[in-house]
């Protein structure tokens, strides 16, 4: 048996992937266990192995198909169940009536690249990952750059209200190392949150031309 | 603005058909789920059946195998074909679409349309 608290949080990434985290207190030493899918309406259920991401959190990602394809809507309602093995048995340990659109986060944006780069200034762009084509171009962004010498969470956040897929970094300085992230965010849901950060874009900015004022 | 338009309510006797029809029409939306819903006087709003997109069907209880659900999510059109009317089927019947308009999702309901089944 397993005491102590159980926290168990779920996301829909808007397409054909639900991500799950399961925490509890209790040991849990070598027990096998798994988060079940079963959709209210649908005639697929689905199921994952939940591997260790800390000593006492596991993790899982429900895979429903085709990357891009559209699995869940708005009156979907998913039973998801963590199941852990008790003997020959299974035992269940959480269980949430899921409501994918209310409980949205979205894949990190992806393919950021340098457009153009000066001595002060650099344009970069990316791409959003599997976003449902529910939202058109109604999602929010946001942006931070890492200076020399700061933290990412001293870096303000610049904020994008709009599916705009590119910003343009001023008042940079010249000839210096910079990294950059960007995350995504739809409008609807109640429990939807940020994506995760994307992978940070390391870009330089060009040397001020000698002799010239700058 | 979006609006929904019933049509196809009337009077028919036990163990008769009707088919309803509603379209979805107004400013740029997405649909995501459209379906029938009714109401009987002293009674709550009652699922009677939807549709969402990936061709999902549900149900209520009552109509299993007498009522059929038919979706066109191009032409944002959904009707219900009734069959094997019994008296309990008599109400108002209210078309729901699920809509989304700027990045969010509401729902949207018909006038109604009445349905009245006599023994």
């Known amino acids: 048996a397993v005491n102590g608290t159980s926290q168990f949080t779920c996301f829909y990434n808007s397409r054909a992937n639900i991500s799950c985290v399961w925490s509890q207190d209790g040991a849990l030493q070598d027990t096998s266990c798994q988060v079940h899918a079963w959709p209210d309406r649908r005639r697929w259920n689905q199921t994952c192995e939940l591997l260790p991401v800390s000593q006492a959190s596991w993790a899982c990602n429900l895979i429903l198909g085709a990357p891009d394809s559209q699995k869940l809507t708005t009156v979907d309602i998913v039973t998801l169940r963590v199941l852990c093995r008790e003997g020959v048995r299974w035992r269940v340990m959480a269980i949430q009536d899921f409501k994918p659109f209310e409980n949205l986060r979205l894949m990190a944006p992806i393919s950021l690249q340098v457009v153009h780069v000066e001595t002060h200034r650099c344009n970069i762009s990316w791409e959003i990952s599997q976003a449902s084509h529910y939202f058109e171009r109604h999602l929010e962004f946001e942006a931070r750059t890492l200076s020399p010498g700061h933290t990412w969470e001293e870096a303000p956040l610049l904020t994008l209200k709009q599916k705009q897929e590119w910003i343009c970094l001023e008042t940079l300085t010249p000839d210096t190392q910079y990294e950059f992230q960007v995350r995504v965010k739809p409008l609807q849901g109640e429990f939807t949150t940020w994506s995760p950060w994307s992978q940070p874009l390391a870009f330089r900015t060009k040397p001020a031309a000698l002799g010239k004022d700058t | 603005e979006v609006q929904l338009v019933e049509s196809g309510g009337g009077s028919v006797q036990t163990g008769g058909s009707l088919r309803l029809s509603c379209v979805v029409s107004g400013s740029h939306f997405i649909s995501d789920v459209m379906g029938w819903y009714r109401q009987v006087p002293g009674k709550q709003r009652e699922l009677v059946a939807d549709m969402a997109d990936g061709g999902s069907a549900k149900y209520g209880d009552s109509v299993k195998g007498r009522f059929t659900i038919l979706r066109d999510s191009v032409k944002n059109t959904v009707t219900l074909q009734m069959s094997s009317l019994n008296p309990e089927d008599t109400g108002v019947y209210y078309c729901?679409?699920?809509?989304?308009?700027?990045?969010?999702?509401?729902?949207?309901w018909g006038q109604g349309t009445q349905v009245t089944v006599t023994s």
């Open positions: 729901k679409a699920g809509l989304w308009i700027t990045g969010r999702h509401s729902d949207y």
